[in-house]
């Protein structure tokens, strides 16, 4: 058996700093949560801790503070590189300044892979932003492969601005190609990551052959096992299992929003990368968890000019 | 076990090239970052070049640049330093060494134990 | 380019001491530091990684820590086996650098 821990953000929505609890500005900082200081002390934790870590963003780190009014997406490229992402996929928000806010700031500033199976350019931006998101890709992990397919909210048109030259065709049908393009690489552990919402995410791991975890964003689902640690109520179980037509428990997660708590699910494959066992919980990021000191200095920095825009 | 064993190391003349074998085994080659590191005769440790798991992405130390090159053959778990123009400079021990599973840079967790090059007229 | 600023270049120690290495980084380089052990005529070894992470293996006595631009390695009593040499190596960004080494020699 081969485990695999999986770290995941969805929904973070600008809040680079600290929150208060109800994830406004903080205000009282020994009761603060969150913010990507806090954030890289907990995944380094784990990562030295545990062997096989994957940390995954599930989209719509666009919009929601002042940090994405003024920087546009240039502080998600910067921090989320500064914390080591291993993929994002892309969720409506990432199109809300057009298809070039996002491919200067993000795609072109990112060191990880951008992912969305179901997003497909035409005309005279299919050229342009080629390469610089990806249906899928296959992450070494350890020893091991495993294969990361995207997928984006298809309302996003309605939501944001992607213009009219990326088509966003239904997640199932775009998805399953891709998955089915990743078995015959040979890989045989495979995570749909994408922004449609709850709804969406479990009906990707009802009909998608061959996915095996679902990490899912945009309705902001609060799953937890036990007595929840803060305010949110869960939606269910983390994971929630949804049972496959071709009759596979496959889980799915999510982990609320705006970087209040970090998804954490640990998975079991056997040899042929079946599932043998998952369960987890999202880890609330409250003031028990140090802001690391190096990251928080360079959010200070940044915070400089944030400060300057605001007066 | 998992083991790394250079060879190709030799004396040389300044303005030759030679080229540098690293064989591996023990671990999935084709998952890692690789990396050269050399130490000349009496001094510290000096970084190289990099090529990530996939071939995709190569980064070479200032003081080799357009000179050196780096490749990999992942059917044959073997990493591969090319060496043009040798300077007297170049003279050191060429160690190669592993790094992480991903596109950052990273540590190295293991080492081979080097070979021996000496740029000389 | 990150410049790796060891301190001491050499110490003398005995046996059961504690001995404490200083590494400095020229810019923030986060916890991407690694501390390396070598040994006359042979290569060395990884001893700690993300500045206080033991490489599997390696005594408990030798521990890191740090962040930001100050680092620390410290052996919390030396042993006949520890004499060698110790660097640093930033891993924040290209091109990696290491520090100039610390010769750890008999008292």
């Known amino acids: 058996a081969w485990e695999l821990t999986i770290l995941h953000t969805n929904d973070v929505h600008s809040r680079l700093e600290q929150t208060s609890e109800d994830s406004s500005k903080c205000v009282n900082a020994s009761r603060c949560m969150g913010g990507v200081a806090r954030l890289f002390t907990k995944v380094q934790q784990i990562r030295r801790a545990e062997p096989n870590v994957l940390l995954l963003d599930a989209g719509d780190q666009y919009q929601g503070t002042i940090w994405f009014t003024v920087y546009k997406g240039a502080e998600v490229a910067h921090f989320m590189n500064a914390l080591r992402y291993d993929a994002m996929a892309l969720g409506n928000h990432e199109f809300d300044n057009g298809v070039e806010g996002l491919i200067e700031p993000l795609l072109k500033e990112a060191k990880f892979p951008i992912l969305s199976a179901n997003i497909k350019a035409k005309g005279p931006l299919a050229s342009q932003i080629s390469g610089l998101y990806l249906p899928y890709k296959v992450l070494p992990v350890g020893d091991e492969v495993v294969g990361i397919v995207g997928y984006t909210s298809k309302e996003t048109p309605f939501l944001s601005n992607p213009g009219t030259n990326l088509v966003f065709e239904d997640e199932i049908t775009a998805l399953q190609p891709e998955v089915d393009k990743l078995k015959t690489l040979n890989v045989n552990k495979i995570i749909a990551l994408g922004h449609s919402g709850f709804e969406m995410d479990k009906l990707i791991a009802q009909k998608v052959r061959g996915v095996d975890v679902v990490v899912g964003g945009h309705s902001n689902t609060f799953l937890y096992t036990g007595n929840p640690p803060s305010k949110e109520v869960p939606a269910g179980k983390y994971p929630f299992i949804v049972t496959s037509d071709d009759g596979r428990k496959v889980p799915v997660v999510q982990a609320y929003a705006f970087g209040k708590y970090l998804g954490y699910l640990k998975i079991e494959f056997d040899e042929r990368g079946n599932v043998i066992s998952s369960h987890g919980n999202p880890i609330l990021l409250n003031s028990s968890i140090p802001e690391d000191p190096s990251i928080k200095a360079d959010i200070n920095k940044w915070r400089i000019k944030l400060d300057n825009y605001s007066t | 076990q998992v083991q790394l064993v250079e060879s190709g190391g030799g004396v040389v003349q300044p303005g030759r090239s030679l080229r540098l074998s690293c064989a591996a085994s023990g671990f999935t080659f084709s998952n890692y970052g690789m990396h050269w590191v050399r130490q000349a005769p009496g001094k510290g440790l000096e970084w190289v070049a990099v090529?990530?798991?996939?071939?995709?992405?190569?980064y070479y130390a200032d003081s080799v640049k357009g000179r050196f090159t780096i490749s990999r053959d992942n059917s044959k778990n073997t990493l591969f330093l090319q060496m043009n123009s040798l300077r007297a400079e170049d003279t050191a021990v060429y160690y190669c060494a592993r790094g992480g599973s991903s596109w950052y840079p990273d540590a190295f967790d293991i080492w081979g134990q080097g070979t021996m090059v000496t740029v000389s007229s | 380019d990150i410049q790796m600023t060891q301190s001491p270049s050499s110490l003398s120690a005995s046996v059961g001491d504690r001995v404490t290495i200083t590494c400095r980084a020229s810019q923030g380089i986060s916890s991407w530091l690694a501390w390396y052990q070598q040994k006359p005529e042979k290569a060395p070894k990884s001893l700690i990684y993300a500045a206080s992470s033991l490489q599997s293996g390696v005594p408990s006595r030798f521990s890191g820590s740090g962040s930001g631009t100050d680092f620390t390695l410290t052996i919390s009593s030396l042993q006949p086996e520890d004499f060698a040499t110790y660097y640093c190596?930033?891993?924040?960004?290209?091109?990696?650098?290491f520090g100039g080494g610390t010769k750890v020699e008999i008292k």
């Open positions: 090529i990530w798991y996939d071939g995709g992405n190569k």
């Open positions: 190596q930033q891993y924040n960004s290209y091109p990696l650098t």
